[in-house]
């Protein structure tokens, strides 16, 4: 397969990854699909340095990341281990709050206005960040 050696147009390169910052909102699943159709994934934050980079670009706006617990435990969309990985939750979060009246709890994580994380209803139309790694071999399926 081919390798991606530079970032696509309108994407920002940082530490061997490419990032795309939306300027409109979508529900978490629709944002996830958008990134996947760009051969990318919702951003996976693995360090304080990456957290600051993303925070700088999104500003004080609720923004989806690639972290959810829709199937039970918290999981990063790219398989990065949640338990041992970087975390930046707001105090007393995640709380899986049911009091919003929208049905169910809160299963999707987002950056809040101060950059720290909160869990929220996945249907909320927040902005999002896509990420893809440079030099990642294409996963083109074989033609039948």
């Amino acid at each position: 397969g081919s390798e991606r050696t530079c970032c696509p147009v309108n994407w920002v390169e940082h530490e061997r990854s490419c990032y795309w910052f939306s300027r409109s909102g979508k529900a978490w699943a629709d944002a996830d699909n958008y990134c996947r159709l760009e051969d990318a994934h919702l951003v996976v934050v693995t360090s304080w340095e990456e957290q600051k980079f993303v925070q700088h670009h999104i500003g004080p706006v609720n923004t989806w990341m690639g972290l959810h617990d829709q199937n039970g435990p918290w999981k990063w969309v790219d398989g990065t281990d949640y338990e041992t990985g970087f975390k930046n939750w707001r105090p007393e979060q995640p709380d899986d709050w049911y009091g919003h009246g929208l049905g169910g709890g809160e299963d999707c994580a987002h950056f809040t206005d101060d950059g720290r994380w909160n869990d929220d209803v996945c249907q909320r139309p927040y902005r999002w960040v896509c990420e893809t790694e440079l030099d990642k071999a294409s996963q083109e399926p074989p033609l039948l």
């Epitope: 397969g1 081919s2 991606r4 696509p8 147009v9 309108n10 795309w20 409109s24 909102g25 979508k26 529900a27 629709d30 699909n33 958008y34 996947r36 159709l37 760009e38 051969d39 139309p125 294409s138 996963q139 083109e140 399926p141």
Partner: antibody, heavy 120, light 107 residues
Framework: EVQLLESGGGLVQPGGSLRLSCAAS????????MSWVRQTPGQGLEWVSA????????FYADSVKGRFTISRDNSKNTLYLQMNSLRAEDTAVYYC?????????????WGQGTLVTVSS | DIQMTQSPSSVSASVGDRVTFTCRAS??????LAWYQQKPGTAPKLLIY???SLQSGVPSRFSGSGSGTNFTLTVSGLQPEDFATYYC?????????FGQGTKVEIK
């Protein structure tokens, strides 16, 4: 100049198969998601399937899921749609469409279309 | 699935007229909307994306507005080449869906 040229349409019996192709030129093919959209005679437009630029992700309309397969060969700048278990309601003009510059979801270029007729 | 409803289904107009078409989504799609023009025997052509952004090369007499569930496409000063069918499309959520179209006919 961006060009998309579909081929492979024709008359097929119900239950049969057909493979559509779309030859692309005039842009960096592997950088763009592509879709198939169909239009039934005298009717509106229906999105059928989409595939990411490097082929790693595909999406389908429920009406074709499990029967149709979208794929691409970036070395040949070609998009494909393998259509199996065809039904009369699949009769339509099939267009390949390129996703817009700098982001997916809107189609900024379309091919001329290829007619698929499913009839006994 | 998100349903897209266009009105009217057809409109009769004259060259020079200002015409407005409406597209309504069954749920909030914010600005994830495009407008296409299609003439008989040809493929659709993108006119407007992101609800109000004019596609490169499209004449400025075409304009789009709206957000949420209600959108409009306006042609200010209809030209002979504008007699066609116009479709809206939502790109908020899969499956992407189109309206049934508005046909503009010569009065």
């Amino acid at each position: 100049e961006v060009q998309l040229l579909e081929s492979g349409g024709g008359l097929v019996q119900p239950g049969g198969s057909l493979r559509l192709s779309c030859a692309a030129s005039g842009f960096t093919f592997s950088s763009y998601a592509m879709s198939w959209v169909r239009q039934t005679p005298g009717q509106g437009l229906e999105w059928v399937s989409a595939i990411s630029g490097r082929g790693g992700t595909t999406f389908y309309a429920d009406s074709v899921k499990g029967r149709f397969t979208i794929s691409r060969d970036n070395s040949k700048n070609t998009l494909y749609l393998q259509m199996n278990s065809l039904r009369a309601e699949d009769t339509a003009v099939y267009y390949c469409a390129k996703d817009g510059y700098g982001g997916n979801s809107f189609f900024d270029y379309w091919g001329q279309g290829t007619l698929v007729t499913v009839s006994s | 699935d998100i349903q897209m409803t266009q009105s009217p289904s057809s409109v009769s107009a004259s060259v020079g007229d200002r015409v407005t078409f409406t597209c309504r989504a069954s749920q909030d799609i914010f600005d994830w909307l495009a407008w296409y023009q299609q003439k008989p025997g040809t493929a659709p052509k993108l006119l407007i994306y992101a609800a109000s952004s004019l596609q490169s090369g499209v004449p400025s007499r075409f304009s789009g507005s709206g957000s949420g569930t209600n959108f409009t496409l306006t042609v200010s000063g209809l030209q002979p080449e504008d007699f066609a069918t116009y479709y809206c499309q939502q790109a908020y959520s899969f499956p992407w869906t189109f309206g049934q179209g508005t046909k503009v006919e010569i009065k």
